[in-house]
């Protein structure tokens, strides 16, 4: 059962796992949610009746029954983790805490103009978990405007004390606001020989990389595969760090793989969700339950629905035993990973999918696409919407993309002369325009947010957000697309598609069925040569065939240029402008979405 409200002046008795320090009960709840075992917590607020050394303590708790006895205690605030909830969860915490000093290892001290600048510095520093900033009213003259970057083993403060005229806050890496590079490559036959901060068991290098990503101190990792010569180290995932933030030594070793934390890419690839099945693999751990199940998929569902289950092993039924049902072993451990991994015993293992809700919805795999052809099939581009205007009569105006449950990203030029959002309708999950009848459900538009610097498409800043009046319930036919990570600026996308209901050629009519075309990206230098009379800026991205023939076309404005990278679709461009339609040596020009991620997040996350 999902309980989101906090219980004031209430303490949960017993079940303690560990104690951390958090600046608020709300953040204590987030920490509990992300902890592998925590189901409940008790936070102590500052209070004259409490010993100041207990202020800001966040006691993480577990219970076999998923609840604990409640005791009345002034200044105690208790609650439940969000593990039991189905809604999307985020560790992003933009709050600034006034007059609080969050203690940790002060590894960097510098002057900053404001707390915001200090927070940005922390966000763009690979080691920084949180910061404390002495304001210009701070009593000690030499400490004024000093920005202290801090880290700890846990990522949370080692203590929190009251201190006048300082402010503290957390790194915004988990808000997708870091400019740090996103290095997704996994390097085969490589060992990073730096200090280990932790080690866990993992079935493959990808799971190891994801574990590294949500471990607060891990910057890179080395994984020893099941073919690693030293048996005791097989399936071992070593979580590593270094002072420079990069591996100091790379050693060539067969059957080992190494890679980096994906903390700067976490909004556009899954980092919590281990959805694969591992055949002929047994995960060992504390046994929670043994249940009969028809298949390993059914076993994974049972694990996902059991809030304390972290991973499972399924042993298929022997011949006709037990109505063809196998045994499903639901398991857990102190850190969420198996204590040992065994091979060759016939089991099928995997992890709970409960953690998938901690990843962005946009990372969910969608159905395989149809190769060839120009007409799309249902569910192929579930983020694509058709934006209709009702004035003077109802018709398709522009495309757009779902990027959040209340947000559509589109082009600013779509709103030429549009004075009010009242004349707009957003239809999602649509394949054919003919499906749209008078009684077809749509989303009304509450607000049109056009980029402040937009003038005309060809000058850039051709980007707009639509805030919907109601929220989109995600299904197979309507779900969000990931924004590119700022750390992905140097990625070369090779699998890009433009979609829309636009004209297939100049002087055509809007197509009934959603059209698709695979289009190669063109460098900005090449694009500039094709548009000598225009300035192709870094905030634009171009795509098209040299010989022409395939392009976005009329009716596709605002629609997505979607690129698949590492099995996840990213909204790389917004169809903006071009000369004519699929003309030779005239690529389409798109708004380069990665350059507007900050703007998008600022507008969509505004309180």
């Amino acid at each position: 059962e999902c309980v989101t409200q906090l219980l004031k002046d209430t303490c949960f008795e017993g079940g303690d796992i560990t104690t951390v320090f958090t600046p608020s009960a709300k953040y204590c709840q987030v920490v509990c949610t992300y902890h592998p075992r925590c189901l409940l917590f008790t936070f102590t607020a500052e209070s004259p009746s409490e010993d100041p050394t207990r202020w800001f303590t966040c006691v993480l708790k577990d219970s076999v029954t998923e609840t604990l006895p409640r005791v009345n205690r002034t200044a105690a605030i208790s609650g439940y983790s969000f593990k039991q909830c189905s809604h999307q969860i985020s560790a992003c915490n933009k709050d600034i805490y006034v007059d609080l000093d969050m203690k940790g290892i002060n590894y960097n001290s510098s002057v900053a103009k404001s707390a915001q600048e200090c927070q940005e510095r922390c966000t763009d520093d690979v080691h920084c978990h949180f910061f404390t900033y002495a304001t210009r009213q701070f009593p000690s003259l030499e400490h004024r405007n000093i920005c202290l970057l801090k880290h700890t083993q846990t990522g949370t403060p080692t203590r929190i004390t009251k201190l006048d005229k300082v402010v503290s806050g957390f790194s915004l890496k988990s808000c997708a606001l870091s400019n740090l590079a996103c290095i997704r490559d996994i390097f085969p036959n490589t060992v990073f020989a730096d200090s280990n901060i932790d080690s866990v068991m993992a079935p493959d290098a990808f799971v190891c990389g994801r574990i590294c990503t949500h471990h607060p101190g891990c910057l890179f990792f080395t994984f020893f595969s099941q073919e690693w010569p030293k048996e005791s180290q097989r399936n071992l995932c070593l979580l590593k760090t270094s002072e420079s933030g990069l591996p100091s030594t790379r050693i060539k070793k067969s059957k080992a793989l190494s890679g980096f934390s994906l903390q700067s890419c976490r909004h556009s690839i899954p980092v919590f969700c281990h959805s694969s099945f591992y055949h002929d693999t047994d995960f060992l751990g504390e046994e929670l339950d043994i249940v009969a199940a028809k298949s390993h998929e059914a076993c994974q569902k049972l694990c996902t629905n059991a809030v304390r289950c972290q991973f499972f092993t399924y042993t298929p039924a022997q011949a006709s035993c037990n109505e063809g049902k196998g045994k499903c072993y639901l398991k857990l451990s102190s850190n969420g990973s198996p204590t040992k991994i065994l091979h060759g015993r016939g089991g099928i293992s995997g992890y709970t999918l409960r953690l998938c809700k901690m990843d962005n919805e946009c990372t969910t795999k969608i159905k395989p696409r149809i190769v060839g052809g120009t007409a799309s099939v249902r569910g192929e581009w579930p983020w694509q919407v058709t934006l209709h205007t009702t004035s003077p009569t109802q018709r398709h105006l522009c495309g757009g993309s779902i990027i959040g449950n209340q947000w559509i990203l589109t082009a600013a030029h779509c709103f030429y002369g549009v004075e009010s959002p009242k004349i707009l309708r957003v239809y999602s999950g649509i394949l054919n325009q003919s499906e749209i009848k008078e009684d077809t459900s749509f989303f009304g538009v509450q607000e049109i947010i056009i980029h402040d610097q937009y003038k005309m498409a060809e000058s850039g800043y051709d980007i707009a957000l639509l805030k919907l009046e109601t929220t989109v319930n995600y299904t197979d036919s309507q779900r969000p697309i990931c924004l590119p990570s700022k750390g992905d600026r140097n990625v070369i996308y090779t699998d890009c598609w433009v979609t829309g209901w636009g004209y297939r050629k100049l002087r055509d009519k809007i197509q009934n069925t959603l059209q698709k075309a695979k289009i190669p990206l063109v460098t900005n230098e090449e694009c500039q040569k094709r548009y000598r009379g225009h300035k192709i800026t870094h905030k634009m991205i171009c795509a098209g065939y040299r010989e022409g023939g395939k392009d976005a076309c009329k009716g596709d404005s605002g629609g997505p240029l979607s690129c698949k990278h590492n099995e996840v679709w990213h909204l790389v461009g917004i169809t903006s402008w071009g000369e004519g339609c699929a003309q030779r040596e005239r690529p389409g020009v798109y708004t380069n979405v990665v350059e507007y991620v900050d703007w998008i997040l600022e507008k969509t996350q505004a309180v």
Epitope: G417, K455, L506, K554, S557, G558
Partner: antibody, heavy 118, light 111 residues
Framework: QVTLKESGPGILQPSQTLSLTCSFS??????????VSWIRQPSGKGLEWLAH???????RYKPSLKSRLTISKDTSRNQVFLMITSVDTADTATYYC??????????WGQGTLVTVSA | DIVLTQSPASLAVSLGQRATISCRAS??????????LNWFQQKPGQPPKLLIY???NLGSGVPARFSGSGSGTDFSLNIHPMEEDDTAMYFC?????????FGGGTKLEMK
């Protein structure tokens, strides 16, 4: 409601500099997306766009006249100005100032007639 | 510069009949979804008034007997049924690229 009013010298001689003022109300040139254009129309003829100024002081001119035109604004006084140097009889026209947001030329002033005569 | 050519230069239409004015652009005024072409009406001694924007959208307070259509380079303005009050000059104008340009105008009279 939105209103714009042009004012100018009425009559001037060739080679002089024409100074026009547009005073407006009902909108602000501090608003993102907002702009004001100058458009002229010789008697009985077509319309010719001359210059535009955006809220952020970015300016656009008709290329063939760019060297003679200067558009400027005083946001606090809700005024936009146009200067045309070295006028001749071909510059005789009614001059309109027009509000243009992120859409078409929506609101026009009544126009001011400028005659260039020796 | 984008050149707009209007035809006919003048037109006389009977009361209640249809008036059609054409506007042809020297290059496309479309931008993948919007036709940046507008129509204005101007009566003697008055400034122009916006009738149609983005090829087919009615300006504020414009009667429904006015309609616009077209895309790319070919556009038309239709008035049906023609009323006495519609006697005026009509101009098309493109907003695709600077310099913004106007057509030469069509004089519409009552037959």
């Amino acid at each position: 409601q939105v209103t714009l009013k042009e004012s100018g010298p009425g009559i001037l001689q060739p080679s002089q500099t024409l100074s026009l003022t547009c005073s407006f109300s009902g909108f602000s040139l501090n608003t993102s997306g907002m702009g004001v254009s100058w458009i002229r129309q010789p008697s009985g003829k077509g319309l010719e766009w001359l210059a535009h100024i955006y809220w952020d002081d970015d300016k656009r001119y008709k290329p063939s006249l760019k060297s003679r035109l200067t558009i400027s604004k005083d946001t606090s006084r809700n005024q936009v100005f146009l200067m045309i140097t070295s006028v001749d009889t071909a510059d005789t026209a009614t001059y309109y100032c027009v509000r243009k947001g992120r859409g078409p030329f929506a609101n026009w002033g009544q126009g001011t007639l400028v005659t260039v005569s020796a | 510069d984008i050149v707009l050519t209007q035809s006919p230069a003048s037109l006389a239409v009977s009361l209640g009949q249809r008036a059609t004015i054409s506007c042809r652009a020297s290059e496309s005024v479309d931008n993948y979804g919007i036709s940046f072409l507008n129509w204005f009406q101007q009566k003697p001694g008055q400034p122009p008034k916006l009738l149609i924007y983005a090829a087919s959208n009615l300006g504020s307070g414009v009667p429904a007997r006015f309609s616009g259509s077209g895309s790319g380079t070919d556009f038309s303005l239709n008035i049906h049924p023609m009323e006495e009050d519609d006697t005026a000059m009509y101009f098309c104008q493109q907003d695709k690229g600077v310099p913004w340009t106007f057509g030469g105008g069509t004089k519409l009279e009552m037959k």
